[in-house]
C-alpha cells in the first residue's frame, strides 16, 4: 500500500515529488540556505525516508531550522555587540568587535556574519577572531637628565619600562603585551633558571610594593651572542607566560620603521629610562632618565681602541651615545633598558637601541655608552615572535 | 550563564528506583532553543546517554534503558527529572544532567554518584 | 546498535600535535561531538558538528570527519590538554559515546 504523501517543513523542500510513494520508493528533505535539518534537538547532514510495506515512512519528517552560530568567543582587550537585535546569533546576524579604546587598535573593521555554515565570518571571509593589538610608544614624556646625570621619571612617561630581577638588576622594554626585549648578558643563564627571573612592570620606585607582576615563559639569546667574548649581537627576547593588560603605565615601545635610520643619525637626541647606578654609586630608587645624543660611530669605536673595555669592541651590530664631556650615560643597573627615540611622523617612540656596555666609569669624557643596534635585529625579533608556538625547553634558543 | 545542578540519594537499594533532579539557573527551562539531557558515568568508565527531554514533555530515550527510564519536566520549578526503575549494581555511576542545544551537550552539572547497593 | 571505537590511550609531547581518532560504520555521514574530561570534573564540550568550537575553547582544538572516522586535533599541546576525550555522535535520535582516549602530555 502506498505511504501518505510527505509534506516539505517550512523553508523546505522535498525530491523527488511523485504522485504516489510505494513500497521502497524514497524522498529527501532539503533545507534552503541558512537552515538546517534538526530532527528533534539533533542536527541532520542529510535526511532521507523510506517507504515501508506497511505504508508508513521509517522515520519522521524533520524540520528546517534556521542555523545557529551561537553566542560569539569573548574578544581579548574588545568587546562584542549585537546588531541584528540582544543576542541574536542566527542566520544573517551581524555582531561588532571593537577593541578598548585608547590602548588597543583592530587590524579589521570587526564586523562578522552568522552565515550559512554556522560561522561567524568577517567580510573578508575570515573565521577566526579579530585581533586587538597594543598600542605602542605613547608616552607622557616630552623630553629635555648612572641613570648618570639623570632626573626622575614621572609616570606614564617610559610605560614600557621592565625591571627585571635575578642575582643582578637590568632592565628590559615591553614590545608586546607578552614578549620583553632586553640585552643577552642580563639574561644569560636564565634559559635554564627561568624562574628566578622577576619581572615587573608598571613601576617608578624600584621597591615599589605595587606592581604588574609577570614570569617568563621563555628565553631566547641570540644565537651569535658568545658570553664573557664582547657584546656583539647582545639582544635577548623573553616569552611572558601571561599577556599583561595594557594602560597609561603599562605599554609595549614601538618597534623602528624602516625610515628609523633617518631618526637616528650622529647627533640626534634619544632617551634611555633605568634603575641603575647613580652618580651616588648606588642603585637608583626612582627610575631615572636622561636625554643623550647618538655618537658618530668611528669615533665611538676609537675612542674604545684608545681605552679599551676588556674583551669588546664596538661592532657594526652597535650604537654610541653620550656626550664627549661625559656626564650623561646609562650605568650598571641600566643593562636591557631601551634607548629610545620619537617618530615625529607618527609621533610614538620607538626602541633603537639596547643598554648593552661602557666603560666602568660611567659618564666619563669620551667613554660612551654602547647600545645593541636594534635595526639589525627586526627579522630575529620578528621571526622568533611569529615562530613561538608555546612552552617547552626547545624553544629556549641559547649559547 | 546557565548552570545546572543535580540532587537526589547518593545511595539506592538494588530494585528500587533511583531518582535525581536538575534545577536549571540562570535560564528557563522553557527555552524553544533547548532541550534537557541525562548521561551517566560508571566509576572508572566511559560516558553514557539514558535521554533528553523537551520543555512541552516530548522525550526520547536510550533504547538500551528505555523500558526502565522516564524524564519529566517541571517547568514552574525550572526542574526535569530522571527515573531509573529496578536499578542493580550495574547502574552504580557519576549522573551528570546537562542542556542539550542542537545535540550539543553544553554545559553540564556537576554530577552526583549514585551507589546502588542493599 | 551503534558503536563509537576510540583508542584507549595515546601521549603527546608538548608543542607537538595530538590526533585523537573516533570511528564508526559511515560516521561522516552524521556529526560527531568532542568533549574533555579532566579528572573530577564534569565533561566539557570543545568541538560540536564536526568542526566547530565552543565559545572559551582555544583555536588549537580543531575537528574533522569524513567516511568511517571523525578526528580531534590539538595543535601546540600544552599540559593542561591532558584529559580524557570522548566523541559522541547521534544514531536515529539515540546519542552513543565512544569509550574515551586517555591524553597523557609527556614531561
Known amino acids: 500500500q502506498p505511504c501518505p504523501d510527505p509534506t516539505a517543513p517550512p523553508n523546505g523542500h522535498i525530491s523527488p515529488v511523485q504522485a504516489t510513494y510505494v513500497l521502497k520508493d524514497s524522498f529527501s528533505v532539503f533545507c534552503k540556505t541558512g537552515f538546517e535539518l534538526l530532527q528533534g534537538s539533533v542536527p541532520l547532514k542529510s535526511f532521507t525516508a523510506v517507504c515501508q510495506k506497511d505504508g508508513s515512512w521509517d522515520r519522521p519528517i524533520p524540520e528546517c531550522s534556521i542555523i545557529d552560530c551561537g553566542p560569539p568567543d569573548d574578544l581579548p582587550n574588545g568587546h562584542v555587540d549585537y546588531i541584528t537585535g540582544p543576542e541574536v546569533t542566527t542566520y544573517k546576524a551581524v555582531i561588532q568587535y571593537s577593541c578598548e579604546e585608547t590602548f588597543y587598535t583592530m587590524s579589521s573593521n570587526g564586523k562578522y556574519v552568522c552565515e550559512a555554515d554556522g560561522f561567524w565570518t568577517s567580510s573578508k571571509g575570515e573565521k577566526s577572531l579579530p585581533v586587538c593589538k597594543p598600542v605602542c610608544g605613547l608616552s607622557t614624556h616630552t623630553s629635555g637628565g648612572q641613570i648618570i646625570g639623570g632626573q626622575p621619571a614621572k609616570p606614564g612617561d617610559f610605560p614600557w619600562q621592565v625591571l627585571l630581577l635575578g642575582e643582578t638588576t637590568a632592565a628590559g622594554a615591553l614590545i608586546h603585551d607578552d614578549w620583553v626585549l632586553t640585552a643577552a648578558h642580563a639574561v644569560y643563564g636564565k634559559t635554564e633558571a627561568m624562574s628566578s627571573l622577576d619581572i615587573r612592570m608598571g613601576i617608578l620606585k624600584r621597591l615599589s610594593l605595587i606592581y604588574t607582576q609577570a614570569w617568563p615563559e621563555a628565553v631566547f639569546i641570540h644565537e651569535g651572542y658568545t658570553h664573557g667574548a664582547g657584546f656583539d649581537n647582545d639582544i635577548a627576547l623573553i616569552k611572558l607566560k601571561n599577556k599583561v593588560t595594557i594602560n597609561r603605565n603599562i605599554m609595549p615601545i614601538c618597534l623602528p620603521r624602516k625610515e628609523a635610520a633617518s631618526l637616528m643619525k650622529t647627533d640626534f637626541v634619544g632617551t634611555v629610562a633605568g634603575w641603575g647606578l647613580t652618580q651616588k654609586g648606588f642603585l637608583a630608587r626612582n627610575l631615572m632618565f636622561v636625554d643623550i645624543p647618538i655618537v658618530d660611530h668611528q669615533k665611538c669605536a676609537t675612542a674604545y681602541t684608545k681605552q679599551p673595555y676588556p674583551g669588546a669592541k664596538v661592532t657594526v651590530n652597535m650604537l654610541c651615545a653620550g656626550l664627549d664631556r661625559g656626564g650623561k650615560d646609562a650605568c650598571r643597573g641600566d643593562s636591557g633598558g631601551a634607548l629610545v627615540f620619537l617618530d615625529n611622523e607618527t609621533q610614538r617612540w620607538f626602541v633603537g637601541g639596547i643598554v648593552s656596555w661602557g666603560s666602568i666609569n660611567c659618564g666619563g669624557s669620551e667613554q660612551y655608552g654602547v647600545y645593541t643596534k636594534v635595526t639589525n635585529y627586526i627579522p630575529w625579533i620578528e621571526n622568533i615572535i611569529n615562530n613561538f608556538g608555546g612552552g617547552g625547553s626547545h624553544h629556549h634558543h641559547h649559547h | 550563564q546557565v548552570q545546572l545542578q543535580e540532587s537526589g540519594p547518593g545511595l539506592v537499594k538494588p530494585s528500587e528506583t533511583l531518582s535525581l533532579t536538575c534545577t536549571v539557573s540562570?535560564?528557563?527551562?522553557?527555552?524553544?532553543?533547548?532541550?534537557w539531557g541525562w548521561i551517566r558515568q560508571p566509576p572508572g568508565k566511559g560516558l553514557e546517554w539514558i535521554g533528553s527531554?523537551?520543555?512541552?514533555?516530548?522525550?526520547y530515550y536510550n533504547p538500551s534503558l528505555k523500558s526502565r527510564v522516564t524524564i519529566s519536566v517541571d517547568t514552574s520549578k525550572n526542574q526535569f527529572s530522571l527515573k531509573l526503575s529496578s536499578v542493580t549494581a550495574a547502574d552504580t555511576a557519576v549522573y551528570y544532567c546537562a542542556r542539550d542545544r542542537r545535540g550539543r551537550f553544553d554545559p553540564w552539572g556537576q554530577g552526583t554518584m549514585v551507589t546502588v547497593s542493599s | 546498535s551503534y558503536e563509537l571505537m576510540q583508542p584507549p590511550s595515546m601521549s603527546v609531547s608538548p608543542g607537538q600535535t595530538a590526533s585523537i581518532t573516533c570511528s564508526g560504520d559511515?560516521?561522516?555521514?552524521?556529526?560527531a561531538y568532542w568533549y574533555q574530561q579532566k579528572p573530577g570534573q564534569s565533561p566539557v564540550l570543545v568541538i560540536y558538528?564536526?568542526?566547530k568550537r565552543p565559545s572559551g575553547i582555544p583555536e588549537r582544538f580543531s575537528g574533522s570527519n569524513s567516511g568511517n572516522t571523525a578526528t580531534l586535533t590539538i595543535s601546540g599541546t600544552q599540559a593542561m590538554d591532558e584529559a580524557d576525550y570522548y566523541c559522541?555522535?547521534?544514531?536515529?535520535?539515540?546519542?552513543?559515546f565512544g569509550g574515551g582516549t586517555k591524553l597523557t602530555v609527556l614531561g
Open positions: 559511515k560516521l561522516g555521514d552524521i556529526y
Open positions: 527531554i523537551y520543555y512541552s514533555g516530548s522525550t
Open positions: 559522541q555522535a547521534w544514531e536515529s535520535s539515540t546519542g552513543v
Open positions: 540562570g535560564g528557563s527551562i522553557s527555552s524553544s532553543s533547548y532541550y
Open positions: 558538528q564536526d568542526n
